[in-house]
């Protein structure tokens, strides 16, 4: 697994470099979680045909993955910093368990995918500092979470390796939209 | 344990109409995709249609579609499959098959998990 920012060796070599300001380390940590996902679809694509089929094999999804809306204020037009911070950190909580369900579906990137669920939880610290109205962020219900779970779990081998690769481009998608949104605050 | 049970296969004319059923037993279907496939002789399995469990929707593939309609009624747990203005390539062994937790609904076989054993359909010119 990729070292995660802030302890790579140019760091230690560095002293005296200026410490990261809240935002360019919130920007090194999205890109650290996708160069991740990328190392994760790698594999994924490598196993199974489900990255070109996908469209088509696919007439409907209730996964309920979250998904950048005009509403949310995270988009050029419309722009709304508050707004579109509490929908990247309810996003970034929504897609835990998701990323739960990554683990164990992986053979060769077993620690990638345990560094993109643990640097995403401290992600989720970093943006919750920055937040100023952290009362508008709604946390997803535990047991609602354990059930989605469950259901992932109990999908057979072929809904499961599509369903895995559906999380992993949401997720890169979601993140991509979040890394832009950040860099207009 | 789950059984899929097709009926309603015959031998019928071009341009004729066949209601295939399909009962499930074991479990309940109302939330899962069904759906239904064909498999004519020397060719493989391909997706006819499908309808969700949550949302009702209906998929056809594009040689049925006007011509097929796909149905359920969750109290009889049951699924349908009215087919009107048969042709002689609709000819084919028509099976049922069920998915089992409903977060995904896909055209393709594997994603399904119970099978029917197939009810034949014979359309003559």
């Known amino acids: 697994a990729p070292v995660p920012p802030g302890e790579d060796s140019k760091d230690v070599a560095a002293p005296h470099r200026q410490p990261l300001t809240s935002s360019e380390r919130i920007d090194k940590q999205i890109r650290y979680i996708l160069d991740g996902i990328s190392a994760l679809r790698k594999e994924t694509c490598n196993k199974s045909n489900m990255c070109e089929s996908s469209k088509e094999a696919l007439a409907e999804n209730n996964l309920n993955l979250p998904k950048m809306a005009e509403k949310d204020g995270c988009f050029q037009s419309g722009f709304n910093e508050e707004t579109c911070l509490v929908k990247i950190i309810t996003g970034l909580l929504e897609f835990e368990v998701y990323l739960e369900y990554l683990q164990n579906r992986f053979e060769s990137s077993e620690e990638q995918a345990r560094a993109v669920q643990m640097s995403t939880k401290v992600l989720i610290q970093f943006l919750q500092k920055k937040a100023k109205n952290l009362d508008a962020i709604t946390t997803p219900d535990p047991t609602t979470n354990a059930s989605l779970l469950t259901k992932l779990q109990a999908q057979n081998q072929w809904l499961q390796d599509m369903t895995t690769h559906l999380i992993l481009r949401s997720f890169k998608e979601f993140l991509q939209s979040s890394l832009r949104a950040l860099r207009q605050m | 344990e789950v059984q899929l049970v097709e009926s309603g296969g015959g031998l019928v004319q071009a341009g004729g109409s066949l209601r295939l059923s399909c009962a499930a037993s074991g479990r309940t279907f109302s939330s899962s995709p069904m759906g239904w496939f064909r498999q004519a002789p020397g060719k493989e399995r391909e997706f006819v249609a499908a309808?969700?469990?949550?949302?009702?929707?209906?998929y056809y593939a594009d040689s049925v579609k006007g011509r097929f309609t796909i149905s359920r009624d969750n109290a009889k747990n049951t699924v349908y499959l009215q087919m009107n203005s048969l042709k002689p390539e609709d000819t084919a062994v028509y099976y049922c098959?069920?998915?089992?937790?409903?977060?995904?609904?896909?055209?393709?076989?594997?994603?399904?998990?119970?099978w029917g054993r197939g009810t034949q359909v014979t359309v003559s010119s």
């Open positions: 309808i969700s469990g949550r949302s009702g929707n209906t």
């Open positions: 098959a069920g998915e089992r937790v409903g977060l995904l609904l896909t055209v393709v076989a594997e994603g399904y998990d119970y």
